[in-house]
């Protein structure tokens, strides 16, 4: 799979979006989780209703949200008040029994406030060290590694 | 249990080569990025490379490339550190460290270090 | 390359005693920064990854903090186990760098 990064501001909420085949994926719960490494685990953050015929109503876990569009096919979490330790490698998952398909991998990138000017110095600005080398924008708040491209990681 | 297990002391001359071996077990390494981290003797820690043992992948840093080559026989669960046109200053102690990569990797484990010493 | 500046470089301190070690980086690194323990003779020990999460076994009177460019370990109630040497290393970019080291010594 391809990442995905999805840029947000400290503060502020982010709307992530994994779109995905409705017919393939016809009946499946899908999840959110967050992966320790780039091989690590991915450990669950939150996942659509249990009765999937009801997927499109939101469900919180903290300041994380899920909500399915089943028939438009389009798995969308909102990270509400996004703080910098909410940085990090995540994936759209749709569940089948005790299996689990990736629809996308997400990188979270947490932008300073350009109104913020306390923690200024805290948080990274963009235009500065990135973490993907040569990973095209997609359109404003995210952007697409190129095929077989390799993230120019963090490490731990 | 799961552990790195390195070969042992190397002392080599000016010009040659070492070839350092770091053998997973407990795990297998195609699930890992091996690093290579050197030390200096009453130095800090130096960050050499890389690699990705599931597609032979590697990434090198600045200072040491096109002196080092890094690979892994995922078969023997082993990483290889090779450092050629050795010279006085690459006498330090080399270790191989296993960890998921990085964003939050949780996943670290080390080898217990090779000496190599460089001298004429 | 992104250097990582640690200070200080050296400390007393004694048993009991809070002790605060900085590191700052050159360039924003986000949250992607461990803290490592180093005993002479020893590997490192992963303590801190992600400027602020125990690593599994590491006893909870060692925290991190910070993001961005400057992070700080702090060790809440120093045991005689923990005179030793610490590092930063930074995972924004490679290659990886760390900070050039924190001796923790017996006063």
């Known amino acids: 799979h391809n990442t995905t990064v999805f840029q947000g501001v400290a503060g502020q909420s982010l709307q992530v979006s994994c779109p995905y085949d409705s017919m393939k994926h016809w009946g499946r719960r899908k999840a959110w989780c967050r992966q320790l490494g780039e091989k690590g685990p991915c450990q669950r953050v939150v996942s659509t209703h249990n009765l999937w015929l009801l997927s499109f109503l939101r469900r919180w876990n903290g300041s994380t949200a899920i909500t399915d569009d089943t028939l438009g096919g389009t798995l969308t979490i909102t990270l509400r008040n996004l703080q910098p330790h909410d940085a990090g490698l995540y994936q759209c998952q749709s569940l089948h029994g005790s299996e689990a398909d990736t629809l996308r991998k997400v990188l979270v990138e947490v932008l300073a406030d350009p109104l913020d000017h306390r923690d200024a110095g805290d948080l990274w600005f963009p235009g500065e060290s990135e973490s993907f080398e040569d990973a095209h924008v997609e359109h404003s708040i995210s952007r697409s590694l190129l095929e077989g491209e390799i993230p120019f990681p963090p490490t731990s | 249990q799961v552990q790195l297990v390195q070969s042992g002391a190397e002392v080599k001359k000016p010009g040659a080569s070492v070839k350092v071996s770091c053998k997973a077990s407990g795990f297998s390494i195609e699930d890992f990025y091996i690093h290579w981290v050197r030390q200096a003797p009453g130095q800090g820690l130096e960050w050499m490379g890389w690699?990705?043992?599931?597609?032979?992948?590697?990434k090198y840093a600045p200072k040491f490339q096109g002196r080092v080559t890094i690979t892994a026989d995922t078969s023997t669960s082993t990483a290889y550190m090779e450092l050629s046109s050795l010279r006085s200053e690459d006498t330090a102690v080399y270790y191989c460290h296993a960890d998921h990569g990085n964003y939050g990797s949780t996943m670290d484990y080390w080898g217990q270090g090779t000496l190599v010493t460089v001298s004429s | 390359d992104i250097q990582m500046t640690q200070s200080p470089s050296s400390l007393s301190a004694s048993v009991g005693d809070r002790v605060t070690i900085t590191c700052h980086a050159s360039?924003?690194?986000?949250?992607?920064l461990s803290w490592y323990q180093q005993k002479p003779g020893k590997a490192p020990k992963l303590l801190i990854y992600k400027a602020s999460n125990l690593h599994t076994g590491v006893p909870s009177r060692f925290s991190g903090s910070g993001s961005g460019t400057d992070f700080t370990l702090t060790i809440s109630s120093l045991q005689p186990e923990d005179f030793a040497t610490y590092y930063c290393q930074q995972g924004q970019t490679y290659p990886r760098t760390f900070g050039q080291g924190t001796k923790v010594e017996i006063k």
């Open positions: 690699i990705d043992p599931e597609n032979g992948e590697s």
């Open positions: 360039q924003h690194i986000n949250v992607w």
